[in-house]
Interface confidence: low
């Protein structure tokens, strides 16, 4: 008769690599007498004999996972016990491997030049797939504007015309490669003035030609305004080449005037406009000239790059020793404050702050900043940032509020000009125009209806429905 023998595991469990939906087997060879009872655990939880996902054979020595799933990852242990000596245990890991899979592929996007586009590409796989992007036929190279995010999504800051094209993402790991379908990025281009009319100081009865050149997609139309009304006299000559329109207004000067060139183009049902003004003054007329408090220049900073209208002139306040540096520092500080506000409020507040600190500027004889239109300011205050504004107003009075919007250089909406009184006297916030289209997708932010509608005038900067494929935050 055989002598009793305590169990000994002769083949310890090893790490097993398995692909999803494949079979994975652990072998736990045991020598003992009498025959042992062998039990199996996964992550210290007993695997039941009747669990149909497993097959336990060879007197319990062979554990087979019949169709491996992601969730099967873990430490598997076999324990053998026959009542002679102590129970013995051996453990090994199951590493579930998975070919790359694109779980959220990119989608077609229409976006306005200068904004930020995000093409999603969420992937699964083990090892974690690396994600790269192809534009047209060649691999896309990252730069200061274009980045592949940790998530695999492609982010394009300050979208340019040349970014238009067909994109696909590629997920790759040691087990294989997955390609998304081709998607199209279409770039809509706002009307933009390339050459603004120049101001003139002439004698009574002179002829003056004002010239205005604009570009856009589609080609803009140019109209001229004299002191706020359509030009009543003078001849207009137009020339269109490629996507550029050149308009010349010839005038016979009998009185001074402010002449505005308005370039407009249409995208679907929406319009985008760009304006540039020039003054025509009569030399004999004396005019007391106030001293200018600043100058117009192109924005060269980083913080508001994606928010401000591309290539527009902004006002720099010379009451600061170094206006560009000072205003950039202010906005930089302000944006850090905005980290505390809600995702709904933040982009709207950023648009408000950037356009408030860097106001659109009419160079002319006296550089003049164009404040934000009251209606847009109120839209931010009462709709997008209602909670934050209430908290700020309430707590500021009691000296309690020290985060969110408390320290921000926000304008006093009531003191701003209304665009209904003079649409040319104030600046619109394009962000709010196109967010308005999608506002129903945001959570309710006030118990009562806001007292302001987001303005929507045909002359306002182009509006688009927000595509889920790009974000403003």
């Amino acid at each position: 008769e055989k002598l009793p023998k305590a169990p000994v595991i002769t083949t310890p469990l090893e790490t097993v690599d398995a692909l999803v939906e494949e079979v994975a087997t652990f072998m736990c060879a045991v020598e003992s007498y009498p025959q042992p009872e062998i039990s199996w655990t996964r992550n210290k939880i007993l695997i039941k004999l009747f669990d149909t996902r497993y097959s336990i054979r060879e007197n319990g020595q062979l554990l087979t996972i019949l169709s491996v799933e992601d969730s099967d990852d873990g430490i598997y242990c076999c324990t053998a016990n026959n009542g002679v000596g102590g129970a013995v245990e051996s453990c090994g890991a199951l590493q579930v491997k998975m070919k790359p899979k694109i779980t959220r592929p990119p989608i077609n996007v229409k976006i306005i030049e200068g904004l930020k586009a995000v093409l999603p590409c969420t992937t699964m796989g083990n090892p974690k797939p690396s994600v790269s992007w192809i534009k047209g036929d060649s691999a896309l190279r990252e730069n200061s504007r274009i980045a592949v995010l940790e998530s695999g999504s492609l982010r394009i800051h300050n979208v340019q015309k040349e970014d238009a094209g067909q994109y696909r993402c590629v997920a790759k790991n040691s087990l294989g490669t997955a390609y998304s379908k081709l998607v199209k990025l279409e770039v809509e281009v706002f009307a933009r003035i390339l050459r603004a009319p120049e101001s003139h100081n002439v004698t009574f009865g002179s002829f003056v030609t004002l010239r205005c050149t604009a570009i856009g997609m589609p080609v803009p139309t140019i109209s001229w305004i004299e002191n706020g009304n359509a030009v009543s006299s003078g001849s207009i000559q137009e020339n269109v080449k490629d996507r550029v329109i050149d308009s010349r207004l010839q005038l016979f000067i009998t009185k001074p005037g402010l002449y505005t060139c308005i370039a407009t183009n249409k995208h679907g049902e929406k319009f985008s406009t760009a304006k540039a003004a020039a003054t025509v003054s009569i030399a004999e007329w004396s005019k007391s000239q106030k001293e200018s408090k600043g100058y117009c220049a192109q924005y060269r900073g980083e913080v508001c790059d994606a928010v401000l209208v591309k290539d527009s002139l902004v006002f720099f306040n010379t009451s600061y020793p170094d206006p560009e540096e000072a205003q950039e520092l202010l906005i930089h500080t302000a944006w850090n404050e905005l980290k505390a506000v809600s995702p709904l409020c933040r982009p709207a507040a950023e648009a408000l702050l950037c356009n408030h600190l860097f106001q659109e500027c009419s160079p002319g004889v006296l550089p003049t900043p164009m404040p934000i239109c009251r209606e847009y300011c109120l839209a931010v205050k009462e709709l997008f940032c209602a909670k934050e504004w209430l908290a700020m107003e309430g707590k500021t009075h009691r000296g309690l509020y020290r985060s969110g919007m408390h320290f921000l250089p926000v304008p006093e909406c009531s003191k701003l000009p209304s665009m209904h009184q003079d649409p040319t006297a104030c600046t619109r916030l394009p962000y709010l125009d196109y967010k308005k289209e999608n506002i129903t997708t945001f959570p309710s932010i006030t118990s009562s209806k806001p007292s302001v509608d987001i303005p929507n005038l045909p002359a306002s900067t182009s509006s688009f429905a927000v595509s889920p494929a790009y974000s403003m935050t």
């Epitope: 790269s132 060649s138 990252e142 730069n143 200061s144």
Partner: antibody, heavy 121, light 112 residues
Framework: EVQLLESGGGLVQPGGSLRLSCAAS????????MSWVRQAPGKGLEWVSA????????YYKESVKGRFTISRDNSKNTLYLQMNSLRAEDTAVYYC??????????????WGQGTLVTVSS | QTVVTQEPSFSVSPGGTVTLTCGLS?????????PDWYQQTPGQAPRTLIY???SRHSGVPDRFSGSILGNKAALTITGAQADDESDYYC????????????FGGGTKLTVL
């Protein structure tokens, strides 16, 4: 004329630290990505680290990750490389190089004369 | 880990044409690696010749040209001159999980 002048090299014991500086002139420093490239005596060029114009991201060769830190001070037109836990294999001439544009991985279009770092006990 | 490969040495007669190549130990070099070429004479800092496959850096003579030949990047020198005797390095932009830039081991060119 673009000029890049490295400094801060020298002899250091294994495990020691050094900080290299690169003073830039002749171009708008804040508009360009920058890199550090090294060359061990008698060996080839080896890219070490890169930083874009904004300084918002940093990139490193795998063997120096966690030991080296690249940074820039755009106001001083200066690029830095802080090297900690130095090893004998870090012995090399370290070149500061300007990228051709704002991005961190454009071509290297201007080079300094290099500063020698010797790691030895 | 992928290694960037170059011929260790090459020789050319004055006035002759030589093509130096730059490959990958696994896979092909494509324009998406944005091959750059650098020249280095002993004791000097490197000098940029070609960037992004085939763009000549300012001040570089048109005797130097870059291209992709098959699965490698190539630097061609036509009408070789004595002062072309140098070390030539290629640099490739690489992205495999993390971005980096890798130089080849260099080719020592001798003008006989």
């Amino acid at each position: 004329e673009v000029q890049l002048l490295e400094s801060g090299g020298g002899l250091v014991q294994p495990g020691g630290s050094l900080r290299l500086s690169c003073a830039a002139s002749g171009f708008t420093f804040s508009d360009y990505g920058m890199s550090w490239v090294r060359q061990a005596p008698g060996k080839g060029l080896e890219w070490v680290s890169a930083i874009p114009w904004s300084g918002g991201s940093t990139y490193y060769k795998e063997s120096v990750k966690g030991r080296f830190t690249i940074s820039r001070d755009n106001s001083k037109n200066t690029l830095y490389l802080q090297m900690n836990s130095l090893r004998a294999e870090d012995t090399a001439v370290y070149y500061c190089a300007k990228r051709s544009g704002r991005i961190a991985f454009g071509a290297l279009d201007a080079w300094g004369q290099g500063t020698l770092v010797t790691v030895s006990s | 880990q992928t290694v960037v490969t170059q011929e260790p040495s090459f020789s050319v007669s004055p006035g002759g044409t030589v093509t130096l190549t730059c490959g990958l130990s696994s896979g092909s070099v494509t324009s998406s690696n944005y091959p750059d070429w650098y020249q280095q004479t002993p004791g000097q800092a490197p000098r940029t010749l070609i960037y992004s496959t085939d763009s000549r850096h300012s001040g570089v003579p048109d005797r130097f040209s870059g291209s992709i030949l098959g699965n490698k990047a190539a630097l061609t020198i036509t009408g070789a001159q004595a002062d072309d005797e140098s070390d030539y390095y290629c640099g490739l932009y690489m992205y495999s999980g993390s971005k980096n830039y890798v130089f080849g081991g260099g080719t020592k060119l001798t003008v006989l």
